[in-house]
């Protein structure tokens, strides 16, 4: 399709992949004085975003309030049925009043019991809170300092005993590697020594003597 190709031609070229810089570059960047990097978002855009966020929050609050209203309505509709007085005579209405009064008394009783429980719970919470404050006063918290921690130590702290085996294995591997490199270094060193010995004064001397 012609339209599709022309659209594709108009599209901007994809940005090249970011160049991976050496750490030395970053070190220099950190140490050398440089201008403060300018924020990519303008003040007006920031304000716009803030307004948008507030709007969303407001809508969310309104929705929650509406949900609560609906929930209250549903709760009331299940507890308070619509009055069906049509066809009921004086006798029934009298009895209905008696029934409703009995129900109100029962609900009042339940409310009183619940209030008593709530009061008891509040008192208990207050007591426990006071105890917490008292205990906080007894033990001074040490000032925490930022500690440099190795990856191994962090692993140990996070994984506990399970990490110990893997760490030991890693340590062992490291050890073996170290020994091998040392051996190599020794051999290389000896060979260099021989070359130096032969090329230097001693070599000439040995050659002359021989």
């Amino acid at each position: 399709m012609a339209d599709g190709s022309s659209d594709a031609a108009r599209e901007p070229r994809p940005a090249p992949a970011p160049i991976r810089r050496r750490s030395s570059n970053y070190r220099a960047y950190a140490t050398e004085p440089h201008a403060k990097k300018k924020s990519k978002i303008s003040a007006s855009r920031k304000l716009q975003l803030k307004t948008l966020l507030l709007q969303i929050a407001k809508q969310e609050l309104e929705r929650e309030a509406e949900e609560r209203r609906g929930e209250k309505g549903r709760a009331l509709s299940t507890r308070c049925q619509p009055l069906e007085l049509a066809g009921l005579g004086f006798a029934e209405l009298q009895d209905l009043c008696r029934q409703l009064h009995a129900r109100v008394d029962k609900v009042d009783e339940e409310r009183y019991d619940i209030e008593a429980k709530v009061t008891k719970n509040i008192t208990e919470i207050a007591d426990l809170t006071q105890k917490i404050f008292d205990l906080r006063g007894k033990f001074k918290r040490p000032t925490l300092r930022r500690v440099r921690i190795s990856a191994d130590a962090m692993m140990q702290a996070l994984l506990g005993a399970r990490a110990k085996e893997s760490l030991d294995l890693r340590a062992h591997l490291k050890q073996v590697k170290k020994e091998d490199t040392e051996k190599e270094n020794r051999e290389v060193g000896d060979w260099r020594k021989n070359i130096d010995a032969l090329s230097g004064m001693e070599g000439r001397k040995k050659k002359f003597e021989s």
Epitope: Q81, P82, E84, L85, A86, G87, L88, G89, F90, A91, E92, L93, Q94, D95, L96, Q99
Partner: antibody, heavy 121, light 107 residues
Framework: EVQMVESGGGLLKPGGSLKLSCAAS????????MSWVRQTPEKRLEWVAT????????FYPDSVKGRFTISRDNAKNTLYLQMLSLRSEDTAMYYC??????????????WGQGSSVTVSS | DIQMTQTSSSLSASLGDRVTISCRAS??????LNWYQQKPDGTIKLLIY???RLHSGVSSRFSGSGSGTDYSLTISNLEQEDIATYFC????????TFDTGTKLELK
Amino acid sequence: EVQMVESGGGLLKPGGSLKLSCAASGFTYSNYAMSWVRQTPEKRLEWVATISSGGSYSFYPDSVKGRFTISRDNAKNTLYLQMLSLRSEDTAMYYCARRDNYFGSTFMDYWGQGSSVTVSS
Amino acid sequence: DIQMTQTSSSLSASLGDRVTISCRASQDITNYLNWYQQKPDGTIKLLIYYTSRLHSGVSSRFSGSGSGTDYSLTISNLEQEDIATYFCQQGHTIPLTFDTGTKLELK
């Protein structure tokens, strides 16, 4: 024509349970409160239960309170009476009746033919 | 509970007679009184409600009166089809109560 037809009666032992039904027709069932009235073998009439038009409220005499439950299905134009822990004194002809009132006076303006319930050991 | 009592459990009368059946309540029921007729086949019909109001389809030979605790049903010009048992019922207080009924017989 207003009509009520009861069904579900029978013979059972004390302590047993039974559910009576009453099919109503000829009027807007959901607009009326309904009642059950029984007639003892001695021909005494006893009001048993009343239910409001929508079924939210029900009324009973002390003699059946806690044992009998009146209910209704307005979609099916049917009235029910669930009877539990039946006693010999519950033996009677059970009538379904439409309830109405005038200036607060409560009355039953149309009655069914009745359904017989016998409780005997 | 309000007790309803009739002066007589049965009454004998001749066709064409004027018959009065009485009913008394144990307390003032402020005209909340109704009358029913039960035929020998067991069918029950409402005759009078609220002391004196005639139910639809009921013959004008039936009339009701009274106040407070004393009420009555009157049948003028008795006919064969009126031979039945008559009950009064108070609609003032729950439980709704009936009297024991008055059986009307031919002489």
